[in-house]
Interface confidence: low
């Protein structure tokens, strides 16, 4: 059976070595194995981790678990059938769902967020759906670096 | 498809002339990955229509250079035409630049299926007149 000549790559993608971002005149270059789209860089994992493991993997690459500006943000992969951990967790202190940078979840982003179990973490499908799952479950994850 | 190949090969493939506001000199709404720009289409087209659509965007119908790229594209999009075809089931599969395509394409024994599709980490043959999502690529 023929298959593609393998490069010297890991069996599953993980964020690459910590490369300083190279700016060009009006935008950016992303690290190897990261996707550039609308002046953001995204790492889309193919391996599954718990929510905390995902958060730490993103942090180790000077990025954070995906914080969505709007449901069109991942338009380029809206055909994907997968769910991915994103950087949303429930804060007992603020009694609100907060992104990793401390900002509150817009009620317009996920209309069903009121039904989310506050003990769970949020997995997102790029066509706009979100669901809450045990934070110990393993999912793929998306890291994001905002570049401008 | 072969009549279009000639026309396609004579096309200019200079993506840098397009508006390049986004990462790594790619046109707006394209994505960058590993020194290439990709247009992730959502429209369904026949294989020949897809070929022409990519040519009109100064790029090529999706080519896949290695397993890593195939894995990445399968994460981004479940299926897409690729720039591989054959003139009939008696002819070899070839790429857009006329080179023999050596990798396995499923269902190759079906004489009606003469254009190739990437589908979730595998390559399959399909009817060239089918309406399938297409992606374009330009190497930086």
């Amino acid at each position: 059976k023929n298959s593609f000549t393998k490069l010297s790559i890991e069996p599953a993608f993980t964020p690459g070595p910590n490369i300083e971002l190279q700016k060009d005149s009006d935008c950016c270059s992303c690290q190897e194995k990261w996707v550039g789209y609308r002046c953001n860089c995204y790492f889309i994992s193919s391996e599954q981790k718990t929510w905390n493991e995902s958060r730490h993997l993103c942090a180790s690459q000077k990025s954070s678990l995906l914080q969505l500006q709007n449901t069109d943000e991942l338009d380029f992969m809206s055909s994907s059938q997968q769910f991915y951990w994103i950087g949303l967790s429930y804060s007992e202190e603020h009694t609100a769902w907060l992104w990793e940078n401390g900002s509150a979840l817009s009620q317009y982003l996920f209309p069903s967020f009121e039904t989310f179990n506050t003990k769970n973490c949020i997995a997102y499908n790029p066509n706009g759906n979100a669901l809450d799952e045990s934070c110990e479950d393993k999912n793929r994850y998306i890291c994001k670096q905002q570049l401008i | 498809p072969s009549t279009l190949i000639q026309r396609h090969n004579n096309s200019s493939l200079n993506t840098r002339t397009q508006k390049a506001r986004h990462c790594g000199h790619c046109p707006e709404e394209w994505i960058t990955y590993s020194n290439s720009c990709y247009y992730i289409g959502k429209e369904r087209r026949t294989w020949e229509e897809s070929l022409l659509a990519c040519t009109s965007k100064n790029s090529s119908l999706l080519s896949i250079d290695n397993e890593e790229e195939m894995k990445f594209l399968s994460i981004i999009s479940p299926s897409s035409w690729i720039g591989v075809f054959r003139n009939s089931s008696h002819h070899p599969w070839v790429t857009m630049n006329g080179l023999a395509f050596k990798h396995e394409i499923k269902d190759s024994d079906n004489a009606e299926l003469n254009c190739a599709v990437l589908q979730v980490n595998r390559l399959k043959s399909a009817q060239c007149g089918s309406s399938i999502i297409y992606h374009c690529k330009h190497k930086l």
Partner: antibody, heavy 124, light 107 residues
Framework: EVQLVESGGGLVQPGGSLRLSCAAS????????IHWVRQAPGKGLEWVAS????????DYADSVKGRFTISADTSKNTAYLQMNSLRAEDTAVYYC?????????????????WGQGTLVTVSS | DIQMTQSPSSLSASVGDRVTITCRAS??????VAWYQQKPGKAPKLLIY???SLYSGVPSRFSGSRSGTDFTLTISSLQPEDFATYYC?????????FGQGTKVEIK
């Protein structure tokens, strides 16, 4: 010769269950999409569900989602439609059909081969 | 879901007539439309796929065309065996849908 043969239809009470089978022969089963399409007496065609036997990808019409389950056994070249919580409006002739499969989200042409159909009657 | 609105629901025609049946998709399905013929008590038969491709073994008097989201089945010269019900079907969406059908009767 390509053949699709349905079986398993019959009379069932509302709320009951039934499993239809579609035995395929004469083609490479896993290279095609298998569909169930139904036709209520004197009415038009309604697509019910689809499966890609190669990877098990399924789709359902909203009218049956959660009640019907489509599956396939590639070792037996057979597709199934498990129908639960049946209602009077599910009464129809159920056909299985195939179409070329190149992606879980589209099929390459129409449904080129059909079975002869099996009648499902839901009545008390 | 994508709706396929088919018209007319029935028509009367004579042998030799040119018959046109139309289907309008509620949103874009590209060329992913098929046409079928069905006779009473029988399974449907595929006539046209990809909007305009004639399925093998189907007489050339049948043809299909597309204009945007409008699809047309034309029978150039109606034959006695063509009296039947015709359906359009879209497969541009994973949730496939059929038109309501057009019954072609003898005038």
């Amino acid at each position: 010769e390509v053949q699709l043969v349905e079986s398993g239809g019959g009379l069932v009470q509302p709320g009951g269950s039934l499993r239809l089978s579609c035995a395929a022969s004469g083609f490479t089963f896993s290279s095609y999409y298998i569909h169930w399409v139904r036709q209520a007496p004197g009415k038009g065609l309604e697509w019910v569900a689809s499966i890609s036997p190669y990877d098990g990808y399924t789709d359902y019409a909203d009218s049956v989602k959660g009640r019907f389950t489509i599956s396939a056994d590639t070792s037996k070249n057979t597709a199934y439609l498990q129908m639960n919580s049946l209602r009077a409006e599910d009464t129809a002739v159920y056909y299985c059909a195939r179409s070329s499969d190149f992606s879980p989200w589209t099929s390459s042409g129409g449904m080129d081969y059909w079975g002869q159909g099996t009648l499902v009657t839901v009545s008390s | 879901d994508i709706q396929m609105t088919q018209s007319p629901s029935s028509l009367s025609a004579s042998v030799g007539d040119r018959v046109t049946i139309t289907c309008r998709a509620s949103q874009s399905v590209s060329s992913a439309v098929a046409w079928y013929q069905q006779k009473p008590g029988k399974a449907p038969k595929l006539l046209i796929y990809s909007a305009s491709s004639l399925y093998s073994g189907v007489p050339s008097r049948f043809s299909g065309s597309r204009s945007g989201t409008d699809f047309t089945l034309t029978i150039s010269s109606l034959q006695p065996e063509d009296f039947a019900t015709y359906y359009c079907q879209q497969y541009g969406s994973s949730l496939r849908t059929f038109g309501q059908g057009t019954k072609v009767e003898i005038k």
